[in-house]
């Protein structure tokens, strides 16, 4: 496969990754699909430095990231280990709150207005951030 050496138009390069910041809202699953359709993934935050970069670009707006616990344990969409990785939850979060009246708990993580993380109902139409790594060989599947 070919390697991507520069970011696509309208994406922002930072530390050998490319980021795309939405200006509209989607449910978490739809945002996840949007990123995958760009051969990318919802942003995976691996450091305080990356947290500050993303926070600078999204401003004080609820924004989905690539972290969820829809199948039990918290997982990053790219397989990055959650337990040993960077975390920036708000105090008392995640709390899997059931009091919202929308059915079920809260299984998807988002940046809040101060940048710290909260778990929320995955159907809420929040903005989102896609990320893809530079120098990653693009996977070309076999033709049928």
């Amino acid at each position: 496969g070919s390697e991507r050496t520069c970011c696509p138009v309208n994406w922002v390069e930072h530390e050998r990754s490319c980021y795309w910041f939405s200006r509209s809202g989607k449910a978490w699953a739809d945002a996840d699909n949007y990123c995958r359709l760009e051969d990318a993934h919802l942003v995976v935050v691996t450091s305080w430095e990356e947290q500050k970069f993303v926070q600078h670009h999204i401003g004080p707006v609820n924004t989905w990231m690539g972290l969820h616990d829809q199948n039990g344990p918290w997982k990053w969409v790219d397989g990055t280990d959650y337990e040993t990785g960077f975390k920036n939850w708000r105090p008392e979060q995640p709390d899997d709150w059931y009091g919202h009246g929308l059915g079920g708990g809260e299984d998807c993580a988002h940046f809040t207005d101060d940048g710290r993380w909260n778990d929320d109902v995955c159907q809420r139409p929040y903005r989102w951030v896609c990320e893809t790594e530079l120098d990653k060989a693009s996977q070309e599947p076999p033709l049928l």
């Epitope: 496969g1 070919s2 696509p8 138009v9 309208n10 699909n33 949007y34 995958r36 359709l37 760009e38 051969d39 693009s138 996977q139 070309e140 599947p141």
Partner: nanobody
């Protein structure tokens, strides 16, 4: 100039198969997700399927899931739609479409290819 040229349509019996192609030119095909949509006689446009630039990620409307397969060959600048187990309700003009950048809408469409499923 961007051009999308569909081919492969025709008359097929229920349960049969067809493979549609869309030859693309005038843009860097390998950098764009691509899409198939269709319009049945007297009905509105319906999204059918989408594929990421590398072909790794694919998406399907519920109405075609498990029967249609989208694929692409970036070396040939060509998009495909393999249509199996065809039904009368699949009768439509099928269009390939290129998204704008940013992805707000489809900015280029092919002229379409007619698929008729009838016994």
């Amino acid at each position: 100039e961007v051009q999308l040229l569909e081919s492969g349509g025709g008359l097929v019996q229920p349960g049969g198969s067809l493979r549609l192609s869309c030859a693309a030119s005038g843009f860097t095909f390998s950098r764009y997700p691509m899409h198939w949509a269709r319009q049945a006689p007297g009905k509105g446009l319906e999204w059918v399927s989408s594929i990421s630039p590398s072909g790794v990620s694919t998406y399907y409307a519920d109405s075609v899931k498990g029967r249609f397969i989208i694929s692409r060959d970036n070396s040939k600048n060509t998009l495909y739609l393999q249509m199996n187990s065809l039904r009368a309700e699949d009768t439509a003009v099928y269009y390939c479409a290129k998204p704008s950048n940013p992805r707000y809408y489809f900015d280029y469409w092919g002229q379409g290819t007619l698929v008729t499923v009838s016994s």
